[in-house]
Interface confidence: low
């Protein structure tokens, strides 16, 4: 009740707790290494509160420091498959605007079939994050195996 | 400025920063793949502020979006052991109430002896999280190698 | 109760959203397994808001529960290299003050070339975190491959 009262003066949203958790929609056509994401409760447990999707890529709507996290699992994969198809690499970066293009987080699969990591990074309104999976193996679309998200942490 | 004003009506606790970090207590009996957790300052650096343990499983007490994270290291393990005992898989999911049962996060060990990941997910009061380790290898109980936690992020 | 009262006078910063994200500066001399970190906007996307660096190690300035995260990638590494040089292990712990010395998080590389994990842990003002990399392989200094950070979560 006290919480609701305070909300009348200051909606929680103004604290800037932007957050998103996405599930894999599809991979790009050949020559496009990007993973295309989707989100929304109708799809399962994914959501966007603040950030938005722009053609399957995540666009930031509030300046701040964000925790970016990702897990990608390769489909139909064993350690033998993974090593035979090495290098398979996942990179998360700012791909737009071009002036701010930079790789934020990069991992190779080596003999594993899953990578998972997270990091803190400053992001600005309008930054679009792309996730590039290079190599011949395809990612699993299972929502508990492959996901990508951001969480606003502070201004 | 507006934030400071709102704080006059709203103490931090009501924001609901529920958080828990657990250490492994024991594995289940045969046919029960669940890991059983424990937490509390007397045990070391584990704690529960909001969520509770119910027979070694973590029960959520506040609706919201949570960051769920886990690391599990297999005991007496080398990459040879891990590959020989493949598949060894760790899954985190809502196991109760049954109507909300779903796998949230899943990883296989392949040739590694540690898995670690994290994700954002909506959880509701009463949700119980279970961590299922399937396979014949046992997890390490070292508190810096195996741990499981949640952090409330926003409503 | 005292916290709620203090909030009435204190701006957002007083909530203690201390946060830091560091990039690798250099490894230590022989017999010193510690990684030495650096941070600041001039270096790229690393930063310190609250915590400080003390001779390349991260010192905490505010009591609370923190999310600690790390990713370390080995340089010039393949799964063959990693397994040949096993064990290569990364440990994050409180190394000072000596009375609070403890390992918080530990991972081995086995046949992989990257480790990444995160955990919640209570830290106190004055705690210094050290990251020890044991083994003969060297870490990559690429800022998207090796990084270390903390985020204050709650009192």
């Amino acid at each position: 009740q006290r919480f609701a009262q305070a909300q009348q003066q200051l909606p929680l949203e103004s604290l800037g707790w932007d957050v998103a958790e996405l599930q894999l929609n599809h991979t790009g056509p050949q020559q496009d290494p990007r993973l295309y994401w989707q989100g929304g409760p109708a799809l399962g447990r994914s959501f966007l509160h603040g950030p938005e999707l722009d053609k399957g890529q995540l666009r930031i709507h509030r300046d701040g420091i964000y925790m970016v996290h990702i897990q990608v699992t390769l489909a139909i994969c064993s350690s033998t498959t993974a090593s035979r198809h090495h290098p398979t690499t996942l990179a998360v970066g700012i791909c737009s605007p071009a002036s701010r293009s930079i790789s934020l987080l990069r991992l190779s699969f080596h003999q594993g079939c899953t990578i998972a990591s997270q990091r803190l990074t400053p992001l600005a309104r309008g930054d679009t994050l792309c996730t590039n999976l290079t190599g011949t193996l395809l990612p699993s679309r299972n929502t508990d195996e492959t996901f990508f998200g951001v969480q606003w942490v502070r201004p | 400025q507006r934030f400071a004003q709102a704080q006059q009506q709203l103490p931090l606790e009501s924001l609901g920063w529920d958080v828990a970090e657990l250490q492994l207590n024991h594995t289940g009996p045969q046919q029960d793949p669940r890991l059983y957790w424990q937490g509390g300052p007397a045990l070391g650096r584990s704690f529960l502020h909001g969520p509770e343990l119910d027979k070694g499983q973590l029960r959520i007490h506040r609706d919201g979006i949570y960051m769920v994270h886990i690391q599990v290291t297999l005991a007496i393990c080398s990459s040879t052991t891990a590959s020989r005992h493949h598949p060894t898989t760790l899954a985190v999911g809502i196991c109760s109430p049954a109507s909300r049962s779903i796998s949230l996060l899943r990883l296989s060990f392949h040739q590694g002896c540690t898995i670690a990941s994290q994700r954002l997910t909506p959880l509701a009061r009463g949700d119980t999280l279970c961590t299922n380790l399937t396979g014949t290898l046992l997890p390490s109980r070292n508190t810096d190698e195996t741990f499981f936690g949640v952090q409330w992020v926003r409503p | 109760q005292r916290f709620a009262q203090a909030q009435q006078q204190l701006p957002l910063e007083s909530l203690g959203w201390d946060v830091a994200e560091l990039q690798l500066n250099h490894t230590g001399p022989q017999q010193d397994p510690r990684l030495y970190w650096q941070g600041g906007p001039a270096l790229g996307r690393s930063f310190l808001h609250g915590p400080e660096l003390d001779k390349g190690q991260l010192r905490i300035h505010r009591d609370g529960i923190y999310m600690v995260h790390i990713q370390v990638t080995l340089a010039i590494c393949s799964s063959t290299t990693a397994s040949r040089h096993h064990p290569t292990t990364l440990a994050v712990g409180i190394c000072s003050p000596a009375s609070r010395s403890i390992s918080l998080l530990r991972l081995s590389f086995h046949q992989g070339c990257t480790i990444a994990s995160q955990r919640l842990t209570p830290l106190a003002r004055g705690d210094t975190l050290c990251t020890n990399l044991t083994g003969t392989l060297l870490p990559s200094r690429n800022t998207d491959e090796t990084f270390f950070g903390v985020q204050w979560v709650r009192p």
Epitope: D18, P41, A42, L43, F47, L48, H49, G50, E52, H61 | - | -
Partner: antibody
Framework: QLQLQESGPGLVKPSETLSLTCTVS??????????WNWIRQPPGKGLEWIGR???????YYNPSLKSRVTISVDTSKNQFSLKLSSVTATDTAVYYC???????????????WGQGTMVTVSS | EIVMTQSPATLSVSPGERATLSCRAS??????LAWYQQKPAQAPRLLIY???TRATGIPARFSGSGSGTEFTLTISSLQSEDFAVYYC?????????FGGGTKVEIK
């Protein structure tokens, strides 16, 4: 109870700018839980989505209208507005404002609509 | 843009009978489809979202099904208040688009 109310001139001359306002009552326009949309319906025809604005002022427009559309928000008045420039007779339609809920239920669907306002473009 | 095609354009049904309305998308929508009802001189009303979930307060006689590119709205037993125009809408991609509508009239 949330209500949306469109207002603005019912008649606009060709080549001029159509301006409409939607007043939101019963909810804060600053909530991240919602998007605020404009949709139109020419007489006897189907519905066409024009565009939307979020609490932060970020907008998405229908590409077919993008060059002529501006949607803005006035949080102090709990209103959002539509401006459509260089109008022609084909812009004659009933214009609706609608809320899109994007938080746990009915994602990206229009759950609350205004009653609509008829705008005729004629000299 | 995703083109939504509804059929038939007009459906003549007697009260108490079942009505089946179709909506086809030019590309897969997963389940990101909604149905609306519009009566003369009124704003549309949300009936179904997520292809099959009834919105709050919508009677059980309305049901949605389908996924991908083919979707169906079924009204199991038409009541007098159900005679209206029905629109499908996709929210899988930009721009958000509606179908041309199906008019359900009294036979």
């Amino acid at each position: 109870q949330l209500q949306l109310q469109e207002s603005g001139p019912g008649l606009v001359k060709p080549s001029e700018t159509l301006s409409l306002t939607c007043t939101v009552s019963g909810a804060s326009i600053t909530s991240t839980s919602y998007y605020w949309n404009w949709i139109r319906q020419p007489p006897g025809k189907g519905l066409e989505w024009i565009g939307r604005i979020s609490y932060s002022g970020s907008t998405y427009y229908n590409p077919s209208l993008k060059s002529r559309v501006t949607i803005s928000v006035d949080t102090s008045k709990n209103q959002f507005s539509l401006k459509l420039s260089s109008v022609t007779a084909t812009d004659t339609a009933v214009y609706y404002c609608a809320r899109q809920i994007r938080y746990n239920w009915n994602p990206d669907t229009f759950d609350i609509w205004g009653q609509g306002t008829m705008v005729t473009v004629s000299s | 843009e995703i083109v939504m095609t509804q059929s038939p354009a007009t459906l003549s049904v007697s009260p108490g009978e079942r009505a089946t309305l179709s909506c086809r998308a030019s590309q897969s929508l997963n389940s990101n489809l909604a149905w609306y009802q519009q009566k003369p001189a009124q704003a549309p009303r949300l009936l179904i979202y997520g292809a099959s979930t009834r919105a709050t307060g919508i009677p059980a006689r309305f049901s949605g099904s389908g996924s991908g590119t083919e979707f169906t709205l079924t009204i199991s037993s038409l009541q007098s208040e159900d005679f209206a125009v029905y629109y499908c809408q996709q929210y899988d991609n930009w721009p958000l688009t509606f179908g041309g509508g199906t008019k359900v009239e009294i036979k």
